[in-house]
């Protein structure tokens, strides 16, 4: 008789990342019989929802259902119908919604309520929509990259307790940059975490981890730009803002009402004699860098050492994976190679920012001008944040690895979030047998 392939015994999970600038849907897949193994869950689909982040729907909540339709329908196609009802769906909203909640808890709740009602209409097992904390965002990003890198697997041969990976089990730190916040998470070396708010204790696969994490709200790349503009316009002599963070020849109009719409610019708010101002790019990396540094208050630190704004930061330790916008921006700038020194990155940023806007538009004809215009700022901001904000040095720069995906799964908080909510990361090391390390593809 002919051998018939047995039906795949797999499970699926869906996580929606409702970020400040957009929403992405991720579909994960894993073999049902290996739920507690490390590294078996992998991403099979990413669907970027067309449009802005959900916080922008505050005045048009009735449009949220349509907004989510395409990607939810894509999930319907990718996941076999027989598994729809048992596939969990989670939506986590990040800093964009944290900011909206700061402005109005009622408006944030209304957006989430409509999101929940929309997602409940699908045949999946909807598990709720919530605003995750900055601490969770940092922690789940750290879990994701270390899970994908195999750092949690205490790989032991089934017949002995001698690990065959000896020098490779030190976890990676996680550096995440979004539009509205940025997270830094790592295991410090024998260092007391002086601030309890920044301390996390995990027991994963039989090992204890004391993890430092902090999320800097308003220090994502988009909100940092709004902050910088709000700070700089304070001292402008008229409605022309000559801005070193934009290419020479670049011009754009900014509404003052838009500038002060976000809670992130409140500290710079003042009455201006105009409703609109014009940015005129002058493309000077050094001046842009100096302007960005003014966003980091380093004059006050109640701990042995701080990042900025009085936030405790232990000495950096080990390798770091830098993902999300850290990766997208540096990839665009062709600066993701590990061997590109910090000095070379700075040199290349100087050259890039100094290029005339018309030249840039011609060189990158396929890129939307809105995004294209901000790479000089974003690249400079990344350098400033990593060097002056987090205290990386020219030497430790080579320990930063700009990562988009690992084993085909996006680096970011969503996988860690799902692993946690589906109880797929055991506290103790599962008992392994000779067969338990067969590989799933």
């Amino acid at each position: 008789t002919q051998n018939k392939a047995l039906p795949e015994n797999v499970k699926y999970g869906i996580v929606l990342d409702a970020g400040s600038s957009h929403t992405s849907l991720y579909i994960y897949k894993w073999p049902a019989e290996k739920e507690n193994d490390t590294g078996v869950v992998h991403q099979v689909e990413e669907c970027r929802v067309k449009g802005p982040g959900i916080s922008k729907f505050v005045q048009k909540v009735n449009e949220i259902g349509i907004y989510l339709t395409d990607c939810m329908e894509r999930a319907r196609e990718v996941i076999p119908r027989s598994q729809h009802q048992e596939t969990p769906v989670y939506l986590g909203a990040t800093a964009g919604m944290r900011l909206l909640r700061m402005e109005s808890e009622e408006l944030a709740d209304r957006v989430l309520d409509v999101v929940e009602r929309s997602l409940s209409n699908y045949p999946f097992d909807f598990q709720g929509a919530r605003i995750i904390t900055g601490q969770e965002e940092g922690a789940y990003g750290w879990i994701t990259i270390n899970y994908l890198l195999g750092k949690f697997s205490q790989k032991t041969r089934w017949f002995s307790i001698v690990p065959y990976e000896t020098n490779n089990q030190e976890t990676f730190g996680a550096l995440d940059l979004g539009g509205a916040s940025t997270q830094v998470t790592f295991v410090p070396q024998n260092q007391t975490i002086e601030s309890p708010d920044n301390a996390l204790q995990f027991r994963l696969y039989g090992k204890d981890y004391n993890v430092y994490t902090h999320s800097f709200l308003c220090y994502g790349k988009d909100q940092a730009l709004w902050q910088k503009l709000a700070k700089d316009i304070q001292v402008a002599s008229n409605e022309i803002l000559r801005d070193p963070c934009f290419h020479p020849g670049y011009e754009a109009a900014v509404n003052v009402s838009d500038l002060y719409k976000t809670p992130c610019t409140k500290r710079f708010e003042m009455t201006l004699p105009f409703q609109q101002f014009r940015i005129q790019g002058i493309g000077n990396y050094q001046q842009c860098h100096q302007s960005i540094l003014e966003l980091f208050n380093t004059s006050y630190c109640p701990y042995s050492q701080c990042a900025f704004n009085g936030i405790f930061l232990p000495p950096l330790q080990g390798d770091f994976g830098a993902f999300s916008a850290f990766y997208f921006v540096m990839k665009f700038l062709n600066l993701t190679s590990e061997k590109v020194s910090q000095e070379k990155v700075t040199e290349m940023m100087k050259k890039f920012c100094a290029q005339p806007w018309e030249e840039i538009k011609t060189s990158y004809a396929g890129v939307k001008e809105k995004y294209l215009s901000e790479y000089c700022f974003s690249g400079t901001y990344i350098l400033s944040l990593l060097l002056q904000g987090y205290h990386f040095t020219a030497d430790s720069w080579e320990h930063i690895h700009f990562i988009g995906k690992i084993q085909g799964s996006d680096a970011g908080w969503t996988l860690g979030y799902m692993l946690n909510l589906t109880n797929m990361i055991p506290a103790e090391q599962p008992l392994s047998t000779p067969l338990s390390h067969s590989t799933y593809v």
Epitope: Q43, V44, E45, E46, L149, E165, T166, N167, N168, D319, K331, S337, E338, K339, V340, E398, H399, H401, I403, G404, K405, I406, Q407, G408, S409, V441
Partner: antibody
């Protein structure tokens, strides 16, 4: 299973061009970079370049600038490498390989043997 | 570019012996970017070890890797006849990605 399929052989005239294909299956094509390598008879491996199928972003070995052009067709999960102005020096086996973080190549194609001969 | 030098070029060994291949880099490499492959005549290369010491899927545990900086090694704990092949190290640390010249393992 994860597979990269390449045609077995191509015979081309000097000065001509050839477009090599590499069809991916068993994984999400846009989730991994695709790399191309050259191996001349009895020689070691040389890296030609890589392409990210999600956004067509490429990195190339300067040695192959003007010689190799990398493209992808997402709809058919196929990567291509066009080799131009071929000479006998280009006679080799060309492999495609999937790349992962750390830039290692975990899945390799079967290789296409290119012979440049008149 | 980073040049990887493998030594020796050819090695002859008997089944049951422990074998070590070395790979020396012209400049320091972070251990996350050094990998090893096995290639048998007429076949495609096969990933053996990735990120210095991680065993690739389906590779026997007699293979192991170690090293840091500019010096890396691949060890076969107990050689078997099927291990006859050429072994290459490769770096992904900088562009262009480069391979060592290979070490050919022959059986005595």
């Amino acid at each position: 299973p994860v597979q990269l399929q390449q045609p077995g052989a191509e015979v081309v005239m000097p000065g001509a061009s050839v477009k090599l294909s590499c069809k991916a299956s068993g994984y999400t094509f846009t989730s991994f970079w695709m790399n191309w390598m050259r191996q001349r008879p009895g020689q070691g491996l040389e890296w030609i370049g890589e392409i990210d199928p999600s956004d067509f972003y490429t990195n190339s070995n300067q040695r192959f600038k003007g010689k190799a052009t990398l493209t992808v067709d997402k709809s058919s999960s196929t990567a291509y490498m066009q080799l131009s102005s071929l000479t006998s020096e280009d006679s080799a086996v060309y492999f495609c390989a999937r790349g992962d973080f750390g830039w290692y190549f975990d899945v390799w194609g079967t290789g296409t043997s290119v012979t440049v001969s008149s | 570019e980073i040049v990887l030098t493998q030594s020796p070029t050819t090695m002859t060994s008997s089944p049951g012996e422990k074998i070590t291949f070395t790979c020396s880099a012209s400049s320091s490499i972070n251990s996350n970017y050094l990998h090893w492959y096995q290639q048998k005549p007429g076949f495609s290369p096969k990933l053996l070890i990735y990120r210095t010491s991680n065993l690739a899927s389906g590779v026997p545990t007699r293979f192991s890797g170690s090293g840091s900086g500019t010096s890396y090694s691949l060890t076969i704990g107990t050689m078997e006849a099927e291990d006859v092949a050429t072994y290459y190290c490769q770096q992904g640390s900088s562009l262009p990605r480069t391979f060592g010249g290979g070490t050919k393992l022959e059986i005595k």
